[in-house]
């Protein structure tokens, strides 16, 4: 049966009508409109953009569009007391200072309110000391330094290159190592692709370009002062000393011209191996401190940023469902940017805008979706996913009872090579089927499907003839919906060729050079990749909101659960002696996965056969599908991470951006050989196996026949 049969509409109003209404030229126009001035969270400019989007969504035909405001903790540099880093001589004189701002790109010289590069939520401070180079500041980098090289970071200022992991994890690792300050820099090895020119002549990072970003370790808490609850007018706020996730040492980002000046003088130990060397003409010595001639010189940080409770605004648009208005499919992406937001977020916001316009056009012609669609323009994503999290905290009771799916819509592009999708296994078949119906925008794939080009360029490592779909991690606004509330979630964007481009993210990420021109000149002049992403995101929303039976396949969850159980068992088996000593068995987990597989298979058979004209039975089956993701939520959360409650997936404890499977067991096993009390440590492994096995079994039972 076609999707449109649910709402008695003319055949014209189907998925094709929705997709055909999406236009590349409109996305281009919207992107231009959203990127002419900065839209930093908490500023008047971003409030004005919120009101503009509210007004336009109303014009497009949504039933209602409201602003939802919250007063949350944000962070800004001091306008009269800039942040910088110095090299000081033995007399304390500053003999070198890092730049105070990025040279503005052509055409933007007279734009006001460009926030200078800073690490949001850094505490104030002016630490001085010897420098230690810590590579990417990953967990394994500090293991190498401390355990193998016997280098002590205590009381030192560490310098780390951006890339590989979320910057907040770098800062946390540096704090735990005893550092008294952190300098983050972009190395050309990670942010300068060979054979491409620097902006404005290409899409590479110039030496004066700097990546902004927050350095929080919120673990899903949202506003640091109101964890678990909305930051509304009557909120009780924690004192700053009790705030969640704030760093305790000063942090500041710099570009590679300034990094060169700091790194070229480094002495002490040589880099342990080639993986610690970037592309600058410096030795990449680890330190501590400068080499012989410069050994009396020190590094000093000057950080004067302030944390301020500030009002933020989400825009929430509603298109009421005709048949199941109490079932919500949500499309959300953020609006706030560090500066112009040419890619992050406005390439996503422009796509959402065009999707809303297309849905609105259909609605004006008499169509309605079967289920309610909510559209969201989130604020303060860059400051820790604050807008989405506060709204979800405020509406958690509705969302946990009515939330069908959340589709994220941040940056539409991070490259122009192929599609990239991260989603719940429930959506695998939806994504496969949809991409088979869409045309590929890729050169050399004219007349071929998106599925075909995607599979060719990004094949699944496990299943031949299928594309790679990744686990959801975090670092974006789906976090609260998926990791806290257990609402099936997904995200899609166009990405680079990870095989040939080893740099992290895209070179101009969070810099002043992320402009409209960057996209229009270098990434997507025809906006064909943006259009494809609009079709994928919009098509997923359309199907989720309009198909009679929810387009979720629980059998795909069974497949990945087996894969994840195998993986975690294999990790544990690196310690066979201890497993034997402490009687560690994964039998309960494998047994639960086996039961899940059998029950999911039977449920899928019933799903094919039941009477879809019976609205009660239809609703019952759909509810079992909707609530399956919810069944993986443990109300107690993960150890020390109460807002990460999904037992199958959580952001990695070592990299917020990455997803980890069976995270409770994984974290219990991590570095277990170094634990002071092995009996306690292996006891926690056994407890986590128990929690995982119980949760998988309990989830399986939600798919059993109800009586």
């Amino acid at each position: 049966k076609s999707s449109n049969e649910a709402t008695n509409i003319t055949p014209k109003h189907n998925m094709k009508a929705f997709l055909d209404e999406l236009k590349a030229e409109n996305i281009k126009k919207f992107l231009y409109n959203f990127t002419q001035i900065p839209h930093l969270a908490g500023t008047e400019q971003n409030f004005q953009l919120a009101k503009q989007i509210q007004s336009q969504w109303k014009e497009f035909g949504l039933d209602s569009v409201e602003l939802a405001h919250y007063d949350v903790l944000l962070s800004y540099p001091n306008k009269t007391h800039p942040n910088y880093i110095s090299i000081i001589n033995e007399d304390g004189n500053e003999i070198f200072n890092t730049s105070l701002f990025e040279p503005p790109p052509p055409g933007y010289e007279n734009v006001s309110d460009i926030v200078p590069p800073f690490s949001a939520f850094s505490p104030q401070g002016m630490p001085e000391g010897d420098l230690v180079y810590v590579n990417y500041a990953r967990t394994e980098d500090f293991f190498k330094l401390e355990r193998d090289m016997k280098i002590n970071c205590s009381g030192k200022i560490v310098i780390a290159r951006y890339g590989k992991v979320f910057r907040g994890n770098k800062v946390k690792n540096a704090q735990l190592a005893g550092a008294k300050g952190v300098i983050l820099y972009s190395d050309p090895a990670d942010y300068f692709a060979p054979g491409v020119k620097s902006y404005p002549d290409g899409w590479n990072l110039p030496g004066g370009g700097v990546q902004r970003g927050n350095i929080l370790n919120l673990n899903g808490a949202g506003d640091p002062l109101t964890p678990g609850y909305p930051a509304n007018e009557y909120a009780y706020r924690r004192g700053i000393a009790e705030a969640v996730g704030l760093p305790s040492i000063p942090v500041h980002p710099i570009g590679y011209y300034d990094a060169q000046k700091l790194l070229e003088k480094m002495g002490g130990s040589a880099p342990p191996d080639s993986s610690w060397r970037g592309s600058l003409k410096v030795p990449y010595n680890v330190g501590p401190g400068f080499t012989g001639n410069f050994s009396t010189q020190k590094v000093k940080m000057h950080i004067h940023s302030t944390n301020e409770v500030t009002r933020i605004y989400n825009v929430i648009g509603t298109l009421r469902g005709a048949v199941e208005p109490d079932r919500y499919v949500i499309l959300g992406g953020h609006r706030d940017s560090w500066v112009f937001g040419g890619i992050d977020p406005q390439s996503g916001a422009a796509v959402v805008h065009e999707i809303v316009r297309s849905f609105g056009t259909l609605k004006k012609e008499g169509w309605r979706p079967r289920r309610t669609i909510l559209f969201a323009s989130w604020d303060a994503e860059e400051f820790g996913l604050l807008g989405s999290t506060e709204w979800a905290e405020e509406n958690s009771r509705l969302l946990q009872e009515r939330g069908v799916a959340y589709i994220n819509a941040d940056s539409s592009i991070e490259g122009n090579y192929t599609l990239r999708v991260d989603c719940t296994p429930l959506m695998y078949s939806l994504v496969h089927n949809l991409t088979k119906e869409l045309k590929s925008p890729d050169e050399g794939f004219e007349g071929k499907s998106l599925y075909e080009s995607w599979t060719k360029k990004s094949p699944s490592p496990e299943f031949s003839g299928m594309p790679r779909i990744s686990k959801l991690g975090s670092g974006n606004d789906f976090e609260v919906f998926f990791q806290r509330l257990g609402i099936a979630s997904g995200r899609a964007r166009y990405t680079k060729n990870w095989e040939t481009n080893k740099f992290s993210g895209y070179p101009l990420y969070h810099s002043v050079y992320e402009t409209y021109e960057l996209v229009e000149k270098f990434y997507d002049p025809m906006f064909k990749y943006h259009l494809t992403v609009a079709q994928v995101r919009g098509g997923m929303v359309f199907e989720l909101a309009n198909s009679i039976v929810l387009p979720f396949d629980c059998r795909d969850y069974a497949v990945v659960l087996r894969k994840y159980a195998d993986k975690i068992y294999s990790i544990s088996m690196k310690h066979p002696q201890e497993m034997k000593t402490y009687s560690v068995s994964f039998d309960s987990l494998f047994s639960a996965v086996k039961n899940f597989t059998e029950i999911a298979s039977k449920f899928s058979e019933r799903l094919q056969d039941f009477d879809k004209s019976n609205p009660i039975v239809l609703r019952m089956m759909n509810d079992q599908l909707m609530f399956l993701e919810r069944a993986f939520i443990d109300p107690l959360g993960l150890p020390d991470r109460p807002f990460y409650r999904h037992v199958i997936y959580a952001p990695s404890s070592h990299n917020k951006y990455a997803g980890e499977s069976f995270p409770g067991i994984y974290d219990a096993l991590f570095d277990i050989e170094s634990k002071v009390d092995p009996s306690k440590a292996w006891g926690e492994v056994k407890r986590q196996i128990y929690v995982a096995a119980f949760t998988v079994q309990a989830a399986a039972e939600t798919l059993s026949e109800v009586a």
Partner: nanobody, 120 residues
Framework: QLQLQESGPGLVKPSETLSLTCTVS????????YYWGWIRQPPGKGLEWI?????????YYNPSLQSRVTISVDTSKNQFSLKLSSVTAADTAVYNC????????????RGQGTLVTVSS
């Protein structure tokens, strides 16, 4: 009484593939209650699990060796085999095949072991 016996060359050149076979006698390899595994002990170091397989051919590999290891089973011959590619001197060890209870590390039977030296 169950017995396991490893066989294969004792000397392998660097960059080549190490191949060992384990023959099981006194019992059937086709039991869902057990996995059949390979473990090794380099000189002066602790025991390292390489990987395991069940009677249906489902494999589990040590993540740090995964890219180089293949374990296969031949139920008709009551044998299972190990292939470890691109070997280096660090792969020099006594290699044992063993049986362990499914989903655990309870090795109840193991072969006597065979020393494999990687050297040119």
């Amino acid at each position: 009484q169950l017995q396991l016996q490893e066989s294969g060359p004792g000397l392998v050149k660097p960059s080549e593939t190490l191949s060992l076979t384990c023959t099981v006698s006194g019992g059937s390899i086709s039991s869902s209650s057990y996995y059949w595994g390979w473990i090794r002990q380099p000189p002066g170091k602790g025991l390292e699990w390489i990987g395991s397989i069940d009677y249906s051919g489902y494999t589990y590999y040590n993540p740090s060796l995964q890219s180089r290891v293949t374990i296969s089973v031949d139920t008709s011959k009551n044998q299972f085999s190990l292939k470890l590619s691109s070997v280096t001197a660090a792969d020099t060890a006594v290699y044992n095949c063993a049986r362990h209870k499914a989903a655990t590390a309870d090795f109840d039977y193991r072969g006597q072991g065979t020393l494999v030296t990687v050297s040119s």
